[in-house]
């Protein structure tokens, strides 16, 4: 029974003249990957990665297809003709064959730059908002703490003056709300069936590609 699933990078876009990484990952199976084939939209071969023989790059693509990272493929010097579907075929033992699909859209440089012109101010504005929110939260927390510590100080000094010997237990303050964290997530369950260098390369690749939330603030609330 085939229990595995192929996870792919899905629909991706890249700039003409640039490069892109095509990546598939087989998960939810203990099957051994014996070979991965990479094919283009017209089902013409791009490359093969065999577990025992290494990489075979289709000769016409040798100049602009780089093997890896891991079992993936890097397409370089992209042209508009590279737009279309790409397929990864995993030959596994004992499961058999799994197939994944990626759609690549190659954008004209001007289109990419145009979208970037809109995206950069938008990202900037979002980042500014996050920074402002973080600062506001920190200010509120600091002020709240100051008020609290002033109250506690006055209570303590009152108690000391009474000299009753009783101690008041002050609950420890929770970690400051609004502390900004940078999340870096590598996909879970990676390299279940892979061993050796490819697996390490794959980990590195996902760590590089991991989503980094730009100064996103995580708010912790303490209940009961």
């Amino acid at each position: 029974m085939m229990t595995g699933t192929i996870e792919t990078t899905g629909n991706i876009s890249a700039k003409k003249g640039g490069s892109v990484i095509l990546q598939c990952h087989l998960s939810s199976t203990m099957a051994q990957v014996t070979q991965v084939n990479w094919e283009q939209h017209d089902h013409s071969l791009l490359a093969i990665r065999n577990a025992e023989l290494g990489w075979h790059i289709y000769p016409a693509f040798k100049d602009r297809v780089a093997p890896g990272p891991g079992l993936g493929l890097t397409l370089q010097s992209l042209t508009m003709n590279d737009t279309g579907e790409y397929f990864c075929t995993y030959h596994t033992y004992p499961d058999g064959t799994y197939r994944g699909r990626i759609f690549l859209e190659v954008l004209e440089s001007s289109v990419a730059e145009h979208s970037a012109r809109f995206q950069i101010p938008l990202l900037g504005a979002m980042a500014m908002m996050l920074v402002v929110i973080c600062i506001a939260v920190i200010v509120v927390v600091v002020l709240a703490r100051k008020k609290k510590s002033l109250r506690i100080h006055s209570v303590e000094s009152g108690l000391q003056r009474k000299s009753t010997g009783q101690e008041e237990q002050i609950p420890s303050a929770p970690s400051p709300p609004g502390s900004c964290v940078q999340a870096e997530a590598a996909p879970a369950g990676l390299c279940g069936e892979q061993q050796g260098d490819d697996c390490a390369e794959l980990h590195d690749y996902f760590n590089v590609l991991s989503y980094r939330s730009l100064g996103s603030c995580s708010f912790f609330t303490e209940t009961g």
């Epitope: 014996t34 065999n50 577990a51 023989l53 075979h56």
Partner: antibody, heavy 119, light 107 residues
Amino acid sequence: QVQLVQSGAEVKKPGASVKVSCKASGYTFTRYSMYWVRQAPGQGLEWIAFIDAYSGGSTYNQRFRGKATLTVDTSISTAYMELSRLRSDDTAVYYCARGGDYGWYLGVWGQGTLVTVSS
Amino acid sequence: DIQMTQSPSSLSASVGDRVTITCRASQSIYSYLSWYQQKPGKAPKLLIYNAKSLPSGVPSRFSGSGSGTDFTLTISSLQPEDFATYYCQHHYGNPLTFGQGTKVEIK
């Protein structure tokens, strides 16, 4: 058209080494791997190893590790195979062959080089 | 290692005959199989790759079929120049291995 021209026949003594060359023409040398196969007299075909002319990386049949060493000189589109510590059972015709477009098969073959090992 | 077993090891046929040679792999090799023709004193020549694909220049009377472990080379109408030895080869793992050969002789 694609052509592979191998060096001439060799007679060697046991324990010696021999270097067979394979000159390629009619295609872009670095786009293909070069394979080496041997055929003992009256016997079948046996794959030795291949070398990626682009990267210079080689993949060997375990049986021939330490026996065969593959190299390329991309400036003159030539592949080489050196056989060391020759024994009489290394007597064979050695073929170079250009790899196929779609995988690890042999698309175009050289004419072969007979290596005779005799004391 | 993946073992390749050809049958028959030799056969006699006449010009115009339909000839079938089989090749069996010791484990599944999907469609990663090629066929070669070798004439005495000559280098082998590629006939079929990926089980059924013909390189340019190979006559259409040659055809290949099969996948997994069982493969067939068929010569639909044997010609005088087809008398030779035929080898199968898998290209799915290390080491690449060939069948022991099938010699096609004139009856």
